[in-house]
Interface confidence: medium
């Protein structure tokens, strides 16, 4: 259903394997980073904290789809992870290694 | 082109009176509003400021479609417009109407 | 060349806290870390914490409050501190450079917990 | 919190290849890098083995890290095994929020 479809945070594992990013990082081997999936139909639900600009491109590909493309269902909040990392050689740790996991998804 | 084809600021010229806000917008009719539009492929561009997230999401699209979507272009900077507007039936005068003009685009 | 030291007591009573000093020479704590690593008698590695070049520390959570690693990064040297000992905190205590992986160990230090 | 399983002990004669087993519990083993680390009698460890199959400088080519995802086990094997190779051997790999997490280790005997 549409409700279903909706702009909504799901999980997304990154195997820091997968994409070649273990050359670098020593720990952890992936993560939880979730993404941002589904529509943003107007009228956009507040929790998805839209801009005026996403309910104007909304309201106007709701009347005429080929004027203006749907607003984008997108991390709007992003939290930090913990990782042991390579810098010259040297294992490194970084208590925050920031805009990794999206904590929040929205409308813009 | 695949780089014409990319994330970047494309006019889009709102009309208050077709979106139904010509109601409570006194002036100016309309004003241009430009819009977000084109892929995000990876490598993401350094002028599109992508996030981290952003370009793992990229990445992992790039190596299976089906385990993430790509990651989207949308307004990374609004400006503010000026409008009369009626206010319990008063003409008012607002400078700075945040958040209705996109001034940048990037990948998110 | 790259040496590690562990200093502190041989003995010390139960309930009591426990100093250790590693004097490090031959590199930098701000660009190497150090791990506490410790080993009752006959018995296997446990890692207790490190204390990151950045300054992060990072603790074992089998240790719970009780543990505190702390520099000086002027004398090069990384402190560890521990309350309230039990005769079961009897061990070798070790200090190690991480690098890439860990390349140098100190020689370690025997602490007998005992009334 | 995984634990990595050692077995206690094991015998070897001099001149033949044995290998050493470190079995995580939970998860998989492939997930995190495992280090082996060689302790003589008495002495401080020194590293064998890290980022699951590099040697660091003058560690014997006699020596080599594996893993087996069907058995869920990290492998060090010792290749033409030599007296001095008699030490205690012990597994380090990471668990989840950047932790050290160390094996029991296994006492290898050289006959």
């Known amino acids: 259903n549409a409700k279903g479809n909706y702009c909504k945070r799901t999980p997304l594992y990154i195997d820091f394997k997968e994409i070649g990013w273990d050359s670098w990082i020593i720990a952890p081997p992936g993560y939880e980073a979730y993404e941002c999936r589904g529509v943003c139909n107007y009228p956009l639900a507040e929790h998805l904290t839209p801009t005026k600009h996403a309910i104007i491109q909304a309201l106007v590909h709701l009347k005429n789809s080929q004027k203006a493309s749907k607003a984008c269902c997108v991390p709007t909040k992003l939290e930090p992870i913990s990782i042991l990392y390579l810098d010259k050689g040297v294992v490194t740790y970084k208590f925050k290694y920031e805009g990794m996991a999206v904590s929040e998804c929205g409308c813009r | 082109n695949a780089k014409g084809n990319y994330c970047k600021r494309t006019p889009l010229y709102i009309d208050f009176k077709e979106i139904g806000w010509d109601s409570w917008i006194i002036a100016p009719p309309g004003y241009e509003a430009y819009e977000c539009r084109g892929v995000c492929n990876y490598p993401l561009a350094e002028h599109l400021t992508p996030t981290k997230h952003a370009i793992i999401q990229a990445l992992v699209h790039l190596k299976n479609s089906q385990k993430a979507s790509k990651a989207c272009c949308v307004p990374t900077k609004l400006e503010p417009i000026s409008i009369l507007y009626l206010d319990k039936g008063v003409v008012t005068y607002k400078f700075k109407y945040e958040g209705m003009a996109v001034s940048e685009c990037g990948c998110r | 060349q790259v040496q590690l030291q562990e200093s502190g007591p041989d003995l010390v009573q139960p309930s009591q806290t426990l100093d250790i000093t590693c004097t490090v020479s031959?590199?930098?704590?701000?660009?190497?870390?150090v791990h506490w690593v410790r080993q009752p008698p006959g018995k296997g590695l446990e890692w207790m914490g490190t204390m990151w070049n950045g300054g992060g520390i990072d603790y074992n959570s089998a240790f719970k409050d009780r543990l505190a690693i702390s520099r000086d990064t002027s004398k090069n040297e990384v402190f560890l501190k521990m309350d309230s000992l039990q005769t079961d905190d009897t061990a070798v205590y070790f200090c190690?450079?991480?690098?890439?992986?860990?390349?140098?160990w100190g020689q370690g230090i025997l602490v007998t917990v005992s009334s | 919190q995984f634990v990595l399983i050692q077995s206690d002990s094991m015998s070897t004669s001099a001149g033949s290849t044995v290998k050493l087993s470190c079995k995580r519990s939970t998860g998989n083993i492939g997930s995190s890098y495992v280090y082996w680390y060689q302790q003589h009698e008495g002495r401080s460890p020194t590293t064998m083995i890290y980022?699951?199959?590099?040697?660091p400088d003058g560690v014997p080519d006699r020596f080599s890290g594996s893993i087996d995802s069907s058995s869920n086990s990290a492998f060090l094997t010792i290749n033409d095994v030599q007296i001095e190779d008699e030490a205690v051997y012990f597994c380090?790999?990471?668990?989840?929020?950047?932790?050290?997490?160390f094996g029991g280790g296994t006492k290898l005997t050289v006959l």
């Open positions: 031959g590199f930098s704590l701000t660009t190497y870390n």
């Open positions: 980022d699951g199959d590099k040697r």
């Open positions: 380090q790999s990471f668990s989840s929020g950047i932790k050290f997490i």
């Open positions: 190690a450079r991480l690098g890439y992986y860990v390349d140098y």
